[in-house]
């Protein structure tokens, strides 16, 4: 009874629910993540426990500082939901659920080029496709390391397409494309494709 009264005596504003968060919300399988469980009351000694569904994953004490739980997300079921419990003597509160989004990384895309050559211009069509990786995938096309297209979002496993027209160039042009999905800081690039200068009949990508 005393324990119940003690917990009731701790007003909600003195001992509110803890907050569970992670700097990384979108992860790939095998990734290590840190989860932070924190509390607004900085002067209490708090015991933090982390749960995934009903599985207890660890316990840490702290005062004024968040508990940091380091995990590895190896299977789909480990995406969550996670919950943190903050406990002070007989009183405990739970955080809201937190779940990770598991995303498969994009594989290196393949860049294909088609060219229609006229006497004065080259009409270039660039196709870029990453055959693996969670959708949507954003594709960006580059010419000589400079982005020449906006990010093109693809929600299906079809190549992104970008058209450009150039005056017949006198120099070689190098093209590549970038594929990126929701995984932060994880982008892959195609092998570069070099378009030779307009000298003679050399136009290996031209439609005859």
């Amino acid at each position: 009874r005393k324990a119940v009264l003690d917990c009731e005596a701790m007003k909600t504003n003195e001992f509110p629910s803890p907050c569970l968060d992670s700097k990384t919300k979108v992860v790939m399988k095998g990734q290590n993540v840190s989860m932070f469980c924190s509390h607004k009351n900085k002067s209490l000694q708090i015991t933090y426990s982390l749960f995934r569904r009903k599985t207890h994953l660890g316990t840490q004490d702290g005062k004024g500082e968040p508990a940091i739980f380091n995990l590895s997300i190896t299977e789909a079921h480990e995406s969550g939901p996670y919950k943190c419990k903050a406990q002070v003597t007989s009183c405990s509160k739970y955080s809201r659920d937190f779940s990770f989004t598991i995303v498969d990384p994009v594989t290196s895309p393949v860049l294909n080029i088609m060219v229609i050559q006229t006497e004065t211009d080259r009409h270039i069509t660039l196709h870029c496709l990453s055959v693996n990786g969670s959708l949507p995938i954003n594709y960006t096309f580059f010419e000589n390391h400079v982005a020449i297209s906006p990010a093109i979002s693809k929600y299906d496993r079809e190549p992104a397409e970008f058209n450009l027209t150039k005056k017949n160039p006198g120099e070689e042009e190098e093209y590549r494309c970038e594929a990126k999905n929701r995984l932060p800081n994880y982008a892959t690039y195609s092998h570069p494709v070099t378009m030779p200068s307009t000298g003679g009949d050399s136009c290996p990508f031209c439609l005859k």
């Epitope: 701790m10 009351n41 900085k42 002067s43 209490l44 000694q45 015991t47 316990t59 840490q60 004490d61 702290g62 005062k63 004024g64 500082e65 968040p66 508990a67 940091i68 002070v88 003597t89």
Partner: antibody, heavy 119, light 110 residues
Framework: ESQLVESGGGLVQPGGSLRLSCAVS????????VGWVRQAPGKGLEWIGI???????YYASWAKGRFTISKDNSKNTVYLQMNSLRAEDTAVYYC?????????????WGQGTLVTVSS | DVQMTQSPSSLSASVGDRVTITCQAS??????LDWYQQKPGKAPKLLIY???KLASGVPSRFSGSGSGTDFTLTISSLQPEDFATYYC????????????FGTGTKVTVL
């Protein structure tokens, strides 16, 4: 009345080990954190580490590796295991119950135990 | 580890003087700061805990203030028994932070 009593200090040779005990009475170790602090002769206070009520342990960066804190709730005792001792580890070692705000309680210290590292 | 910068490192004062000691933490320690008094050969004695709470049995001439990183211990009217060394201590601790002591302030007779 709550009190903490340190024991286990004494003379030890460089490279040796020592285990200090902190017997706690009038305090439930499962409700409070207990830390270790030391003071070399003529020097200031130096924080070593702390063990929380559920048993998680945090150390000052200089103490990691050579110093280990543990506790036995059934004996109401906290321990400080010290390995590879050096002359500069000569100090009075104190254990202390940490401050908490519910109920509002200040820290409570033992009287200390002297550790002398010398050949 | 948190670094606690205490100043001054020493001061001379007379009985009846108002004495102020400051402590600055390298990281936010909220209100988790204690002040101790220590006399030679004795264990530290708690004066103030959680930045401003007076410990049991401590005279009201001692007071503490501050939060976050900047803290102050004030002795409103220095008494003969107050000549000692004073330490601040950050008492925040956890996964990413551990406490620490200031370097001390020795208060001597002018």
């Amino acid at each position: 009345e709550s009190q903490l009593v340190e024991s286990g200090g004494g003379l030890v040779q460089p490279g040796g080990s020592l285990r200090l005990s902190c017997a706690v009475s009038g305090i439930d170790l499962s409700s409070y954190a207990v830390g270790w602090v030391r003071q070399a002769p003529g020097k200031g206070l130096e924080w070593i580490g702390i063990i929380g009520r559920s048993g998680s342990i945090y150390y000052a960066s200089w103490a990691k590796g050579r110093f280990t804190i543990s506790k036995d709730n059934s004996k109401n005792t906290v321990y400080l295991q010290m390995n590879s001792l050096r002359a500069e580890d000569t100090a009075v070692y104190y254990c202390a119950r940490d401050v908490d705000s519910r109920p509002p309680t200040g820290s409570l210290w033992g009287q200390g135990t002297l550790v002398t590292v010398s050949s | 580890d948190v670094q606690m910068t205490q100043s001054p490192s020493s001061l001379s004062a007379s009985v009846g003087d108002r004495v102020t000691i400051t402590c600055q933490a390298s990281q936010n320690t909220y209100s988790n700061l204690d002040w101790y008094q220590q006399k030679p050969g004795k264990a530290p004695k708690l004066l103030i805990y959680q930045a401003s709470k007076l410990a049991s049995g401590v005279p009201s001439r001692f007071s503490g203030s501050g939060s976050g990183t900047d803290f102050t211990l004030t002795i409103s009217s220095l008494q003969p028994e107050d000549f000692a060394t004073y330490y601040c201590q950050s008492t925040s601790w956890g996964s990413s932070y551990v406490g620490g002591f200031g370097t001390g302030t020795k208060v001597t007779v002018l």
